[in-house]
């Protein structure tokens, strides 16, 4: 697995550069997150045809995966700074249930997955240290999210390779969209 | 990295349009997000407008918005400027970049790819 951010061997090469801002620390992370992301798609594109399948056919599934929309203030019409880093907050916590599922989905990337599971958690800590109204962030439920483990679990294996490939896709357009956003805070 | 190459500058009157084309021939280009930046006479580079790998998710700067529209067609490997009310203020030249994390931003900083850039003139 890769080197968590800020503990390469560029870093330690150069003891004297000026620490990391929050946002700088932020953006580092995600970016490090998505490269993981890519190794895991790289698999699992590999193991599978998923890949190939047109985005309006994935569509069709029953996920309920977090996706940025215009109310969200992350885009540029509608830009609202609190408004949206509550949103990438919420959304980073419900994903913390599918990112769980993928835990055992990986055969040669199983660090890779455990990687991108603890440093999105590592993300959920920095952001919530930027946002003054954390009481409007609402943690998924406990319950919830066990018995949707379950049922994603309980799926026949074709279902569980497109539920990875999606996962992984919706994960990376949130992170995306995401970074885009606090780039302008 | 991939090699990107700008084309479709030149000599406007003020009030007309230009689109700007910016190519690759690099495989995976649908995953880039795409920045348009420009340098005026004596001026800094600055940031007009970027495309995330989801084209839906577009910004523009202050000075362009409502006038520029930024579009990217994955089958051609083109991303486009469509420059419309074009003002003199607009002369540059127009530099498009790449991020290999389909993200983009404001900030040449952000991106890892850079075309050689394009001409634009606006003038009477």
């Known amino acids: 697995a890769p080197v968590p951010p800020g503990e390469d061997s560029k870093d330690v090469a150069a003891p004297h550069r000026q620490p990391l801002t929050s946002s700088e620390r932020i953006d580092k992370q995600i970016r490090y997150i998505l490269d993981g992301i890519s190794a895991l798609r790289k698999e699992t594109c590999n193991k599978s045809n998923m890949c190939e399948s047109s985005k309006e056919a994935l569509a069709e599934n029953n996920l309920n995966l977090p996706k940025m929309a215009e109310k969200d203030g992350c885009f540029q019409s509608g830009f609202n700074e609190e408004t949206c880093l509550v949103k990438i907050i919420t959304g980073l916590l419900e994903f913390e249930v599918y990112l769980e599922y993928l835990q055992n989905r990986f055969e040669s990337s199983e660090e890779q997955a455990r990687a991108v599971q603890m440093s999105t958690k590592v993300l959920i800590q920095f952001l919530q240290k930027k946002a003054k109204n954390l009481d409007a962030i609402t943690t998924p439920d406990p319950t919830t999210n066990a018995s949707l483990l379950t049922k994603l679990q309980a799926q026949n294996q074709w279902l569980q390779d497109m539920t990875t490939h999606l996962i992984l896709r919706s994960f990376k357009e949130f992170l995306q969209s995401s970074l885009r956003a606090l780039r302008q805070m | 990295e991939v090699q990107l190459v700008e084309s479709g500058g030149g000599l406007v009157q003020p009030g007309g349009s230009l689109q700007l084309s910016c190519t690759t021939s690099?495989?995976?280009?649908?995953?880039?997000?795409v920045g348009w930046f420009r340098q005026g006479p004596g001026k800094e580079r600055e940031f007009v407008a970027d495309?995330?790998?989801?084209?839906?998710?577009?910004w523009y700067a202050e000075s362009v918005l409502g006038r520029f529209t930024i579009s990217r067609d994955d089958a051609k490997n083109t991303v486009y400027l469509q420059m419309d009310s074009l003002k003199p203020e607009d002369t540059a030249v127009y530099y498009c970049?790449?991020?290999?994390?389909?993200?983009?931003?404001?900030?040449?900083?952000?991106?890892?790819?850079w075309g050689q850039g394009t001409q634009v003139t606006v003038s009477s």
């Open positions: 690099g495989r995976r280009f649908s995953e880039y997000a």
């Open positions: 495309i995330g790998e989801q084209a839906e998710n577009t």
């Open positions: 970049a790449a991020d290999k994390y389909g993200v983009g931003g404001n900030a040449q900083g952000y991106y890892d790819s």
